[in-house]
Every structure is written in structure tokens, then in C-alpha cells.
Interface confidence: low
């Protein structure tokens, strides 16, 4: 007869490992007992369990509660055992010794491989600001056995660098994603993808990019200067900008205080019925935690009577 086993048994951390050992004998042969031991190189054999045809299963104290026979029905020639809740320390060489009658003893070895799936972590880099050079956006670390693969999935343009640290029974892989921050990256996902033979599917951790910036400011409302005449109601100036974090707006007048009746409402400056007092240089000041911008415009309130007088002069001059 002969023993049937596997060269390598692979399980994921925490799963049950079936250690196969089946005696394929001739008709009439019987298995008296099966002894399982751990036999790592350089260390003495450590008994796991003994399966006796008459007395049943005996588990050594070191493995008490962790070694069982497979559930019934059982073939009397099957000496396989289950190692419950495999841990990383279980990885190594195992041997089964089968005592048969009348053929004698047989032995076979297998290697137990315990996969330790990674628990990845993503750490965002320092605050991203538009205008910075190449900056760390995020780093992703995953430790497992064997070493996991760490990659990035994103539409954002950037560069990656990886490094690995080997430990006694595992390896930690860290990948960094660097980019040149721009406002278009705001809200874009940066996903760390971790692959490992112990995972049914890739693990993904998504970080949303947040880039501080402040756009140039501009003022709208003076497109048609002829509308800015004495008596006009509802005149307003609107300050245009965008930023992250969202900016705040402040209005001042360069050549004196804001005239009475002028209302400041965030990005908008509202005027009462226009008078010549409203002529002047107005400044919109936009700021956020990242930066500040100014935009100034000159308001020149026209007097229709003066204008009509000028037109008459021009006509008479021609």
C-alpha cells in the first residue's frame, strides 16, 4: 500500500486546515494508528495527535481543542485531521506516520502554508495646496504573509513609490502616491488597491483629495458704464472667485469709507439710488485659509444732464 497526502496545504489565517493522510492499501489490510507530528527543520518532532483504531483520538496538550477528526462518515483507512483556527505560528512541516497490519509503517510529509490577509491602512499626506510642487497625497500600508501587492487606482496624474519591510513571518508593503496639487483634483478619489492570495477580492480604500486654492478675483456689474447714472436703482457689483475652503468676501472703498446706504451682502455690493457720491474706487477682497486676492474697479456715476449738455456742445461744434 501507499500513503496519499498533499505536498502543500494552504489556508487563510483563522480557517480550519485539513491535513490529509489516507492509506491506500491492499484488500484485508488494516490501519492500527496514525500519529501526527510537527517536524520543522532543526527542531525535534512535536506530537499533535494520535488516532487509534480502538481508543480513538488523543490530542497532545499543546494542541488541545484545536485538532479534530473530519466529520463522519469516516473511512477506517483515512488518518486525516483538522487543525482548527490556523494561526501564523502553525505554518511549517507536518508528518503523518501510519501503522498498518500486516504491511507495517508508512510516513509522509506535507507543508502547511498560512496566508495572513493584509489589513490595509491609508494615511493622507499633508494638506494639499495649489502651487506646491510634487507632494505626498497619501500612503497606503498593508502587512501580510506572503507580501501583499499595493497599487493605486485613480484618474489623477501622479507618481508612486513602494518599499517593503520583511518581518519574521510577514512583510509590510508601503506605497506612496505623490502629485502636483491642482484645483481640478478636488473631490477626485484616490484608491489604494491591495491584492493578496488570502483575499477573495482586492481590498480598496478610497481617499478623497482636497486641494486648497483661491482663484483670481474679478468684479462683475460694470459691463455697461452707461447704466451707472444718477438716480439708477438696483445697481450692484458682484465679486467672482472660487476657492477651497470656500472664500469669504469683503468690500472696501479705496478713496474713503463706503457711502451710506451701500449694502454689503457677502460677494455682492448693493447701491441705493445712485448719486455722484457713489463714484470711486471699490475693492473686493477675497480670502480663505489658503490665500487672499483683491480686485478693484472704478465706478464713475454719470450725470445725464451734463451728458446731454456735452452732446449739444458737440453738435454745435460740428
Amino acid at each position: 500500500g501507499e500513503l496519499e497526502t498533499s505536498d502543500v496545504v494552504t489556508v487563510v489565517l483563522g480557517q480550519d486546515a485539513k491535513l490529509p493522510c489516507f492509506y491506500r492499501g491492499d484488500s484485508g489490510e488494516q490501519v492500527g494508528q496514525v500519529a501526527w507530528a510537527r517536524v520543522d527543520a532543526g527542531e525535534g518532532a512535536q506530537e499533535l495527535a494520535l488516532l487509534h483504531s480502538k481508543y480513538g483520538l488523543h490530542v497532545s496538550p499543546a494542541y488541545e481543542g484545536r485538532v479534530e477528526q473530519p466529520p463522519p462518515p469516516r473511512n477506517p483507512l483515512d488518518g486525516s485531521v483538522l487543525l482548527r483556527n490556523a494561526v501564523q505560528a502553525d505554518e511549517g512541516e507536518y508528518e503523518c506516520r501510519v501503522s498498518t497490519f500486516p504491511a507495517g509503517s508508512f510516513q509522509a510529509r506535507l507543508r502547511l502554508r498560512v496566508l495572513v490577509p493584509p489589513l490595509p491602512s491609508l494615511n493622507p499626506g499633508p494638506a494639499l495646496e495649489e502651487g506646491q510642487g510634487l507632494t505626498l497625497a497619501a500612503s497606503c500600508t498593508a502587512e501580510g504573509s506572503p507580501a501583499p501587492s499595493v497599487t493605486w487606482d485613480t484618474e489623477v496624474k501622479g507618481t508612486t513609490s513602494s518599499r517593503s519591510f520583511k518581518h519574521s513571518r510577514s512583510a509590510a508593503v508601503t506605497s506612496e502616491f505623490h502629485l502636483v496639487p491642482s484645483r481640478s483634483m478636488n473631490g477626485q478619489p484616490l484608491t489604494c488597491v491591495v491584492s493578496h492570495p488570502g483575499l477573495l477580492q482586492d481590498q480598496r480604500i478610497t481617499h478623497i483629495l482636497h486641494v486648497s486654492f483661491l482663484a483670481e478675483a474679478s468684479v462683475r456689474g460694470l459691463e455697461d458704464q452707461n447704466l451707472w447714472h444718477i438716480g439708477r436703482e438696483g445697481a450692484m457689483l458682484k465679486c467672482l472667485s472660487e476657492g477651497q475652503p470656500p472664500p469669504s468676501y469683503n468690500w472696501t472703498r479705496l478713496d474713503g469709507p463706503l457711502p451710506s446706504g451701500v449694502r454689503v451682502d457677502g460677494d455682492t455690493l448693493g447701491f441705493p439710488p445712485l448719486t455722484t457720491e457713489h463714484s470711486g474706487i471699490y475693492v473686493c477682497h477675497v480670502s480663505n485659509e489658503f490665500s487672499s486676492r483683491d480686485s478693484q474697479v472704478t465706478v464713475d456715476v454719470l450725470d445725464p444732464q451734463e451728458d446731454s449738455g456735452k452732446q449739444v456742445d458737440l453738435v454745435s461744434a460740428s
Epitope: 484618474e155 481640478s184 478636488n186 478619489p189 478623497i208 486641494v211 477651497q244 475652503p245
Partner: antibody, heavy 125, light 107 residues
Framework: EVQLLESGGGLVQPGGSLRLSCAAS????????MSWVRQAPGKGLEWVSA???????YYADSVKGRFTISRDNSKNTLYLQMNSLRAEDTAVYYC???????????????????WGQGTTVTVSS | DIQMTQSPSSLSASVGDRVTITCRAS??????LNWYQQKPGKAPKLLIY???SLQSGVPSRFSGSGSGTDFTLTISSLQPEDFATYYC?????????FGQGTRLEIK
């Protein structure tokens, strides 16, 4: 006026398919990220799927492989193709817009600031 | 996935009361936290974005605070129209997740 209007809901048997549509108006649709969020009867809100302005798509585990989100920027319309429907997919489905005052950046930071009125999907035999 | 836990699940209060609802994330989400109000038969409405920023058109009696894992929505003086269900939602990473909701009822 900024508006989202869902359609396409109805009664369907388990294993069947439906396609939801969401017509957007009043804003530059192509600049914004959009999501579908659902609410089962008497239950809380559950995010279903998102699509970025660039076309990247994301799904909740509960619908991955069964639902497909897409957009047609020329028609200002968001879609949700729902296949292999189950009883637990029964819900009101809302179309939502991500973004604050400017849709050109910071999709997630602002949360979902515009919601449709919802369309009801009932999966039952 | 990031889990969001709201407390309390329901709350009874009177008009004029100061009300606080809390939301806890299972991991740090910086300030990527939004609050919504939903009335029966209606779509949710965004109240607060980025943990503490008041959405345009929302009354100033609503305020938000917090960062990292712990967040708070406060209504300084409850009005009759504020009785509704309130949800928090993280926008730090996909899948986007909501709290289970807090139902605010009239005492």
C-alpha cells in the same frame, strides 16, 4: 431653477430589470458628480451608486454586479440600469447632485445639495 | 466601510427648545460630514456640509460642529417646521454611508 426629475420606477418581479432615468435642468450637468440614493419603506437612507463628471463609477456592495450607473451629458440625463432585482431592492430611489456653489471642484466636500422627488421601485411576485 | 452611528434614535422636544443630535464615525473622516433633514413623503434636504458649513437658504438656528469621529447637529431654538428625521452622512470615502436617522417629535 435647479431640478432633478426621476422616472422609470414601477412594479417588477424578482429577477427582472428596470432602468431609472433622472433628467437634470438648471445647472451645467456635465460638471457635477451624481449619485443614486434609495430608501426602503420605513427605513433610512442608503447610497447606491455614484458617477463622476469624468465617468468614474462607484457602487455599494449590495448592488455591485447587478446595477450600472451611466450618464448622457448631451441629454443632461443620469441613468441606473437595475438587473437581477431582489425584494430587498424595493425602495424609493432618489437622484442626487454632489457639489456646492461650483460644480467644477470638490464634489464630495459639499454633500448632496440637490435631490429629486424620488421614483418608487417595487420588486414583488 | 465606514459606519455612522447616530444618537438618539428618537427625540421628543418642544418649540423653543435647544436640541442636539450626535453622530459618530467608525474611523476618522476629518470634516467630511453632512447633515440632512427629511420630512415624511419628501426628499431629504442638505442642512450642513463639511461638518459646520451652513447650506445656502438654511436658517441660522441650525449649526454643526465636530471633526474626526464625533460630530454634532444643534438646533438652537426649535421651530414647528423643524420636526422631522435627521441623517448624518460621511463623504470621506466610498461607499458613502448614512447614519440610521434621528426622529425629532413634538413633546
Amino acid at each position: 431653477e435647479v431640478q432633478l426629475l426621476e422616472s422609470g420606477g414601477g412594479l417588477v418581479q424578482p429577477g427582472g430589470s428596470l432602468r431609472l432615468s433622472c433628467a437634470a435642468s438648471g445647472f451645467t450637468f456635465s460638471s457635477y458628480a451624481m449619485s443614486w440614493v434609495r430608501q426602503a419603506p420605513g427605513k433610512g437612507l442608503e447610497w447606491v451608486s455614484a458617477i463622476y463628471s469624468g465617468g468614474s463609477t462607484y457602487y455599494a456592495d449590495s448592488v455591485k454586479g447587478r446595477f450600472t450607473i451611466s450618464r448622457d451629458n448631451s441629454k443632461n440625463t443620469l441613468y441606473l440600469q437595475m438587473n437581477s432585482l431582489r425584494a430587498e431592492d424595493t425602495a424609493v430611489y432618489y437622484c442626487t447632485r454632489h457639489g456646492g456653489d461650483s460644480g467644477s471642484w470638490s464634489y464630495y466636500y459639499y454633500g448632496m445639495d440637490v435631490w429629486g422627488q424620488g421614483t418608487t421601485v417595487t420588486v414583488s411576485s | 466601510d465606514i459606519q455612522m452611528t447616530q444618537s438618539p434614535s428618537s427625540l421628543s422636544a418642544s418649540v423653543g427648545d435647544r436640541v442636539t443630535i450626535t453622530c459618530r464615525a467608525s474611523q476618522s473622516i476629518s470634516s467630511y460630514l453632512n447633515w440632512y433633514q427629511q420630512k415624511p413623503g419628501k426628499a431629504p434636504k442638505l442642512l450642513i456640509y463639511a461638518a459646520s458649513s451652513l447650506q445656502s437658504g438654511v436658517p441660522s438656528r441650525f449649526s454643526g460642529s465636530g471633526s474626526g469621529t464625533d460630530f454634532t447637529l444643534t438646533i438652537s431654538s426649535l421651530q414647528p417646521e423643524d420636526f422631522a428625521t435627521y441623517y448624518c452622512q460621511q463623504s470621506y470615502s466610498t461607499p458613502l454611508t448614512f447614519g440610521q436617522g434621528t426622529r425629532l417629535e413634538i413633546k
